[in-house]
Interface confidence: low
């Protein structure tokens, strides 16, 4: 007869990312008895939700429970049955649900409360839905990515993401770009934080970090994106917009009701006297980029420097990780790798912006053509908030890192998040065996 | 229709703060850019900041003196003005409004006004 | 900032005559992706909050009556009362609403002759 195995001594955790396009559940999973050890917990399992983000739900909060079943059960499949009550679940909401809330305090506080009442009826240990701040979601990010890459820890680190090692505990910096927000995270060298808003400090294994953050709301991919199109729209002669950020030949009719929903286009609403307009793709990749910095304001600036907006941004500092959207467009672009310069980008943007419709959908047959159309945006409005917006230039892409995964475990604000909620960063440096810790982040 | 409801007129002592408050009403508070706009006695209008998505715009002049803040939960915009001397004494206005990042159309709303006395 | 400049500082007119008033930005207020100029008219009479007359530099605000109008584009701009009513008398600014910090004229006193 076979010797069964001994029981893992393993705990599981679940997270779910509420984002403004879609949710994503993630269930971690680590030792027991090293609870406190950085580096430890790693992702098992990622399920996306079929469907839009839950801020969508608004006129239809009762399809809420559905919506949520299938990656729910698929947890319950993942995580042994015994440890079903003692896994905690959360569920954090990001930009969508942000300016849901600009919106209607009330129509927002009722897709949480379904989307509570329904991550109740599971059998797991729930811990609560709620909005995170701009600032919790650059901050967890940061962390996420220090945490896996073995930033925290005296003991080498598993993964070497760059090829050349500088200062081994010295952190990277995170960039982070959603549908609705993006957050740029990072330790500023020796500088002051001129902004209190955007000073972060912390106290991690015994060290101290302060640490810069600023979540610009509608200026995620999909938010700008309806920001340039209100914009571009008030200069059109007629309801037809010539727009370069879309491929030649493509065509799409937007609805003015839709473009005006978002809080983020507020600033350009105006009376216009057509119901829809039709986008007509010119594919040019430099008019596009001029059209996309008219979304920053770089005239105003408080401070001794600026990102955009008057919002204050330290000179950068160090290597960073571009990760969620950042990374997914890069990836289908092929743009990822170390080796592409800033320059290289560049032209490879010019070429694929300038390609046909026709002939990109038949290169990409297997792409929804919502998605596809939009990666000619999408990565000009990469290079022109990196560039223009955090000020990087050509020599300091080369401290760009565009990260999907690191060691099997998404980069995002998810880990981040749960190993705070769940006491696993302890303040203090932990001895070699697990104590009890007081101080957390 | 917005409205914008001010608090009352305020007497205060040289070195002091005042908080004034702006309520506003038939609309939807969170998406209303707020500028503050005084005005000294016989004289013009002056821009002293404003608040719009969350994030506020102050004047130069009034940097680190000025503190606009916004309680989406009651509707109610606030400037605090501290370190009060005489010639801050005023009418100060909120208004719905501002720059090109923060309303598009001017200042189209305003408050009844605020009448600030600094004197000892 | 941007400095606003009005002229003249005060106007006398009589019933029924037209009034024009004048200010001129230290730089464009014209943005160029909409075409559309960031300069607002207020008239403001004693005791009153401001009251917003024309935004985009020409165009009226809800309820204004027709005889206000705005004209200009870049840096000069006008606001013409076309037949003044004893109403208007009031003092008048222009802001630019283009940069922060948002600035205004001077204010020009409009009285009746």
């Known amino acids: 007869t076979q010797n069964k195995a001994l029981p893992e001594n393993v705990k599981y955790g679940i997270v779910l990312d509420a984002g403004s396009s879609h949710t994503s559940l993630y269930i971690y999973k680590w030792p027991a008895e090293k609870e406190n050890d950085t580096g430890v917990v790693h992702q098992v399992e990622e399920c996306r939700v079929k469907g839009p983000g839950i801020s969508k739900f608004v006129q239809k909060v009762n399809e809420i429970g559905i919506y949520l079943t299938d990656c729910m059960e698929r947890a319950r499949e993942v995580i042994p049955r015994s440890q079903h009550q003692e896994t905690p679940v959360y569920l954090g909401a990001t930009a969508g649900m942000r300016l849901l809330r600009m919106e209607s305090e009330e129509l927002a506080d009722r897709v949480l409360d379904v989307v509570e009442r329904s991550l109740s009826n599971y059998p797991f240990d729930f811990q609560g839905a709620r909005i995170i701040t701009g600032q919790e979601e650059g901050a967890y990010g940061w962390i996420t990515i220090n945490y896996l890459l073995g930033k925290f820890s005296q003991k080498t680190r598993w993964f070497s993401i760059v090829p050349y090692e500088t200062n081994n505990q010295e952190t990277f910096g995170a960039l982070d770009l959603g549908g609705a927000s993006t957050q740029v995270t990072f330790v500023p060298q020796n500088q002051t934080i001129e902004s209190p808003d955007n000073a972060l400090q912390f106290r991690l294994y015994g060290k101290d970090y302060n640490v810069y953050t600023h979540s610009f709301l509608c200026y995620g991919k999909d938010q700008a994106l309806w920001q340039k199109l209100a914009k571009d729209i008030q200069v059109a002669s007629n309801e037809i917009l010539r727009d370069p950020c879309f491929h030649p030949g493509y065509k799409k009719v937007v609805n003015v009701s839709d473009l005006y929903k978002t809080p983020c286009t507020k600033r350009f609403e105006m009376t216009l006297p057509f119901q829809q307009f039709e986008i007509q793709g010119i594919g040019n990749y430099q008019q596009c980029h001029q059209s996309i910095l008219e979304l920053f304001n770089t005239s105003y600036c408080p401070y001794s420097q600026c990102a955009f907006n008057g919002i204050f941004l330290p000179p950068l500092q160090g290597d960073f990780g571009a990760f969620s959207a950042f990374y997914f467009v890069m990836k289908f672009l092929n743009l990822t790798s170390e080796k592409v310069s800033q320059e290289k980008v560049t032209e490879m943007m010019k070429k694929f912006c300038a390609q046909p419709w026709e002939e990109i959908k038949t290169s990409y047959a297997g792409v929804k053509e919502k998605y596809l159309s939009e990666y000619c945006f999408s990565g000009t409005y990469i290079l022109s908030l990196l560039l223009q917006g955090y000020h990087f230039t050509a020599d300091s892409w080369e401290h760009i890192h565009f990260i999907g995964k690191i060691q099997g475990s998404d980069a995002g604000w998810t880990l981040g998040y749960m190993l705070n909620l769940t006491n696993m960063i302890p303040a203090e440096q932990p001895l070699s065996t697990p104590l009890s810790h007081s101080t957390y982040v | 229709q917005v409205q914008l409801v001010q608090s009352g007129a305020e007497v205060k002592k040289p070195g002091s703060s005042v908080k004034v408050s702006c309520k506003a009403s038939?609309?939807?508070?969170?998406?209303?850019?707020i500028s503050w706009v005084r005005q000294a006695p016989g004289q013009g209008l002056e821009w002293m900041g404003g608040?719009?998505?969350?994030?506020?715009n102050y004047a130069q002049k009034f940097q680190g003196r000025v503190t606009i803040t916004a309680d989406e939960s009651t509707s109610t915009a606030y400037m605090e003005l501290s370190s009060l001397r005489s010639e801050d004494t005023a009418v100060y206005y909120c208004?719905?409004?501002?720059?090109?990042?923060?309303?598009?159309?001017?200042?189209?709303?305003w408050g009844q006004g605020t009448t600030v006395t600094v004197s000892s | 900032g941007i400095v606003m400049t009005q002229s003249p500082d005060s106007l006398a007119v009589s019933l029924g005559e037209r009034a024009t008033i004048n200010c001129k930005s230290s730089?464009?207020?014209?943005?160029?992706?909409?075409?559309?100029?960031?300069l607002a008219w207020y008239q403001q009479k004693p005791g009153q909050p401001p009251k917003l007359l024309i935004y985009?530099?020409?165009t009226r605000a809800s309820g204004v009556p027709d005889r206000f109008s705005g004209s200009g584009s870049g840096t000069d701009f006008t606001l013409t009362i076309s037949s003044l009513q004893a109403e208007d008398v009031a003092v008048y600014y222009c802001?630019?609403?283009?940069?922060?910090?948002?600035?205004f004229g001077g204010g020009t006193k409009v009285e009746i002759k």
């Open positions: 730089q464009s207020v014209l943005f160029s992706s909409n075409n559309k100029n960031y």
């Open positions: 038939g609309g939807t508070f969170s998406s209303l850019p």
């Open positions: 802001q630019q609403y283009y940069l922060y910090p948002l600035t």
């Open positions: 985009w530099a020409s």
């Open positions: 608040i719009g998505f969350g994030t506020a």
């Open positions: 208004a719905r409004g501002g720059a090109k990042y923060a309303g598009r159309y001017g200042m189209d709303v």
